[in-house]
Amino acid sequence: PEPPTACREKQYLINSQCCSLCQPGQKLVSDCTEFTETECLPCGESEFLDTWNRETHCHQHKYCDPNLGLRVQQKGTSETDTICTCEEGWHCTSEACESCVLHRSCSPGFGVKQIATGVSDTICEPCPVGFFSNVSSAFEKCHPWTSCETKDLVVQQAGTNKTDVVCGPQDRLRA
């Protein structure tokens, strides 16, 4: 019979022969032959392989280094890598989460549109007309200006994106 040019899923072609790939959590020790099956070996502690593979080395689990602000979100197994995230108040600098930076604060005149998570930074937005923020914060949204009318007061000083309006008493009509 003709030697195969392509193999089934979870197989690979070697020496004109289709050999079984090693399952996740195992690495390749020796290719199959006409007479023997593929020989695979489990990954050791702190190692993993997450796909059907023909790798001769397992990958080492990622180390979530506390010195870089990292902590373990999910422990690795023989089939999965460790997932790192950042300590409270910090977020990852990349998708791989290899280090962390402090969450950004929104300056006065800006409010928090989206609070930061372990993997994303704070998203700030400028306070629109009618709203203000007078603090630098990673949590505070823009606050609406005080409504003087509802307090039977009048605006004595207009608000800005950084300051609230100042209300005062209405001028009494003189007789």
């Epitope: 020790v29 489990p42 990954c43 702190s46 190692e47 080492q60 373990v72």
Partner: antibody, heavy 118, light 106 residues
Framework: EVQLVQSGAEVKKPGATVKISCTVS????????IHWVKQAPGKGLEWMGR????????KYDPKFQGKATMTADTSTDTAYMELSSLRSEDTAVYYC???????????WGQGTTVTVSS | QIVLTQSPTIMSASPGEKVIITCSAT?????ILWFQQKPGTSPKLWIY???NLASGVPARFSGSGSGASYSLTISRMEAEDAATYYC?????????FGGGTKLEIK
């Protein structure tokens, strides 16, 4: 800084029980396995077993099954090993150590000497 | 269980001499760890994942091997290298150590 600090030396009578502790700092104990290793006077290292502090899962060398009981308290970041029915052969230094890749140092405790003597 | 046999059990080397310590397993393992221990102190991780030097280990050390056969090499022996070296496998339970190789300086 990662540290594993073990409890102090113990002198016990044959038949007694001893519980030694290993308190970690610099990482959460639940994130990595804790291994226990025995070294009898003038002898080599013997792997006794390991615990996954996150769920309490343990693996023992059959030689130490029934002799050693490993536990962990994640609230205090402390692992414990209890040795029961002590005999003179249990006289040794006992070490706790982490998964090898923690900071690529594979940290070890300073060792706890257990002496069994009548 | 996997038995690890270290060779030699004891050896001495002169400063500058090349040293090779071997570790043979009764079955294939994924990797080997090497530990260095000096009298009265805790063991230290020396080589991990067969060939990676642990933090602070001098570059004159190297590790190699695969399957059931592994080795630790010191390219040029120095006085501070005198210690006992242990190999360990962490692939199959129960994890096991080799019997140790005591390396002395001549």
């Amino acid at each position: 800084e990662v540290q594993l600090v073990q409890s102090g030396a113990e002198v016990k009578k044959p038949g007694a029980t001893v519980k030694i502790s290993c308190t970690v700092s610099g990482f959460n104990i639940k994130d990595y396995y804790i291994h226990w290793v025995k070294q009898a006077p003038g002898k080599g290292l013997e792997w006794m077993g390991r615990i996954d502090p996150e769920d309490g899962d343990t693996k023992y060398d059959p030689k130490f099954q029934g002799k050693a009981t490993m536990t962990a308290d994640t609230s205090t970041d402390t692992a414990y090993m209890e040795l029961s029915s002590l005999r003179s052969e249990d006289t040794a230094v006992y070490y706790c150590t982490t998964s090898y890749y923690v900071g690529t140092y594979g940290y070890w405790g300073q060792g706890t000497t257990v002496t069994v003597s009548s | 269980q996997i038995v690890l046999t270290q060779s030699p059990t004891i050896m001495s080397a002169s400063p500058g001499e090349k040293v090779i310590i071997t570790c043979s397993a009764t079955s294939s393992v994924s990797y080997i760890l090497w530990f260095q221990q000096k009298p009265g102190t805790s063991p230290k991780l020396w080589i991990y994942s067969t060939s990676n030097l642990a933090s602070g280990v001098p570059a004159r050390f190297s590790g190699s091997g695969s399957g059931a056969s592994y080795s630790l090499t010191i390219s040029r022996m120095e006085a501070e290298d005198a210690a006992t070296y242990y190999c360990q496998q962490r692939t199959f339970y129960p994890y096991t150590f080799g019997g140790g190789t005591k390396l002395e300086i001549k």
